[in-house]
């Protein structure tokens, strides 16, 4: 004989289980009895916290008996076999069904033995990332957001940025009973730093398996910033041309370059190309301070750079020559 | 109220079967358990058997296996206990006893009066 | 074969107090036993008292409690009344089996 106590009969169950709305799951519950335990199950028995009666019995003579027959069924539970596994399925999930269930075996002798399960009822969500395009602003104004549409419990969200800015996160009512919809902003001061970067939005959720990160490349309009470059302040005469050329950072894209001098229209010797001004060779020095006007759709700016071609021994030196 | 009503006293022969009813009156017959249990004279208590009305399944001391059979008849709510190949050590008096649930819990709830059997040739 | 003892006689005055304990010869006994006690007068039927170690039963006065004593299971009545005087029997569970003890001789005198 095995020593007394050793032979219990266990319910088991998981003490939490995740169903999605709309769909159907099942509440697992099996009594373990022991290889030398005799035990006798006459009734199965599911009921919710809360509420007066059961919602499922499954008798020994008799059968299954459920409040709402059409969105219950005991799993296995069958009449003429050993009453092992009350498992019972749910269908058509609906928020109100989430909550705590009691799973009971009565057995004989051993008496009755429940066990409790929490049922989570879920709903993943859909998300979705989209810039927000600006101008500079000069102060904090959303750049992104990130929407996660419909969760079952709401979504989390945060941002990953390199960029410095904060979160801005604020709920909703879903589509869905039940649901919420989570939307979340990137705040930050627009600057022409910031335009064609990313910053990335990371959603969890407890029906993913992992947290889904969606990245969103920023825009930020801003008038042109303009420099000139090609000029390394060697430049002499009787050598090869030269080319000056005007660089420009903007959003959108500039729509014109115009080349100048502080003394009005370009000396002969300079020829503007686009973005680019030829400088021709010369055969006396010079002192000229040139203009590049850039235009975009916010606006028009500009660069100045002043170019000096001095006499000297071409050989010596690069000359004119900027290839 | 709740009554298990035995059958009277039996006298057999060594190797001769006897059969004991009990009748159950005042709850569901089918959802409930009964136990067999024997008293021989000047020895304590030894339980035979049980059965669940509703099915007939049993579950048999070893001692008393292939000798013993319980049954029992739903229409009449009565529940039976066959022994064959009786011997004198057979001779006890035979209780049948219902389990009754005390919340979560079965216990020996309600008695029969008791059956006399006396084995002698 | 399991072996359940108890204490052959007991006496408790009227009013008092009064353990009568159940050893098993295989060991402590434990709620997997669901201990049982039941009750029998002279020329009456038997009655039970406590089922799974501690639930008295429907009907059952509050003076009878179900325990576990150490190792063994117990049956307390506290404030005797003379009309207690009866045979006190525990049955222990045993797997697929239960066993009697051979009883407890209660006198209340």
């Known amino acids: 004989w095995p020593p007394p106590g050793t032979g219990d009969i266990v319910v088991q169950a998981p003490t939490q289980v995740p169903g999605f709305l709309g769909d159907s799951v099942t509440l697992p519950c099996y009594l373990q009895v022991p290889g030398m335990e005799e035990t006798h199950v006459s009734q199965l028995t599911w009921s919710r916290h809360g509420e007066s009666g059961s919602m499922a019995v499954f008798h020994q003579t008799q059968g299954p008996n459920y409040s709402e027959p059409k969105r219950l069924e005991f799993v296995a539970a069958r009449l003429g076999t050993e009453l092992r596994d009350a498992s019972l399925r749910m269908f058509g999930l609906r928020v109100e069904d989430e909550g705590n269930y009691t799973c009971l075996f009565v057995a004989f002798p051993q008496g009755s033995r429940s066990v409790d399960i929490w049922l989570r009822v879920l709903a993943k969500p859909q998300n979705t990332a989209e810039v927000q395009k600006v101008q500079l602003t000069g102060k904090p104004v959303p750049v992104a957001r990130c929407v996660s549409t419909g969760g079952r419990p709401p979504a989390h969200i945060t941002w990953h940025s390199d960029l410095g800015g904060m979160p801005n996160t604020s709920q909703a009512p879903g589509f869905l009973s039940g649901t919420v919809t989570v939307t979340s902003l990137w705040i930050l001061v627009p600057s022409s730093q910031v335009d064609g970067k990313s910053v990335t939005c990371k959603v969890e959720h407890e029906s993913f398996e992992k947290p889904q990160l969606l990245t969103v490349n920023l825009t930020v309009y801003y008038p042109p910033e303009v420099s000139i470059s090609g000029y390394d302040n060697n430049w002499y005469l009787s050598q090869n041309e030269a080319t000056l050329t005007c660089d420009a950072r903007s959003n959108p894209e500039p729509t014109g370059y115009n080349w100048s001098t502080t003394m009005g229209p370009l000396p002969p010797f300079a020829v503007a190309q686009g973005a680019q001004l030829l400088i021709r060779p010369v055969d006396k020095p010079i002192n000229t301070t040139f203009i590049c006007n850039v235009t975009n759709a916010l606006g028009a700016r500009q660069a100045e750079l002043t170019v000096q071609v001095k006499e000297g021994p071409p050989s010596e030196h690069s000359g004119m020559s900027s290839n | 109220q709740v009554q298990l009503v035995q059958s009277g006293a039996e006298v057999k022969k060594p190797g001769a079967s006897v059969k004991v009813s009990c009748k159950a009156s005042g709850y569901t017959f089918t959802s409930s358990y009964i136990s067999w249990v024997r008293q021989a004279p000047g020895q304590g208590l030894e339980w035979i058997a049980w059965i669940y009305a509703g099915t007939g399944d049993t579950n048999y001391n070893q001692k008393f296996t292939g000798r013993v059979t319980m049954t029992t008849d739903t229409s009449t709510s009565t529940a039976y206990m066959e022994l064959r190949s009786l011997r004198s050590d057979d001779t006890a008096v035979y209780y049948c006893a219902r389990h009754g649930l005390t919340g979560r819990h079965w216990y020996f709830a309600v008695w029969g009066q008791g059956t006399t059997v006396t084995v002698s040739s | 074969q399991a072996v359940v003892t108890q204490e052959p006689s007991l006496t408790v005055s009227p009013g008092g107090t009064v353990t009568l304990t159940c050893r098993s010869s295989t060991g402590a006994v434990t709620t997997s036993n669901i201990a049982n006690w039941v009750q029998q007068k002279p020329g009456q039927a038997f009655r039970g008292l406590i089922g799974?170690?501690?639930n008295r039963g429907p009907g059952v006065p509050a003076r009878f409690s179900g325990s576990l004593l150490g190792d063994k299971a117990a049956l307390t009545l506290s404030g005797a009344q003379p009309e207690d005087e009866a045979e006190y029997y525990c049955i222990l569970w045993y797997s697929n089996k239960f066993v009697f003890g051979g009883g407890t001789k209660l006198t209340v005198l």
């Open positions: 799974g170690t501690n």
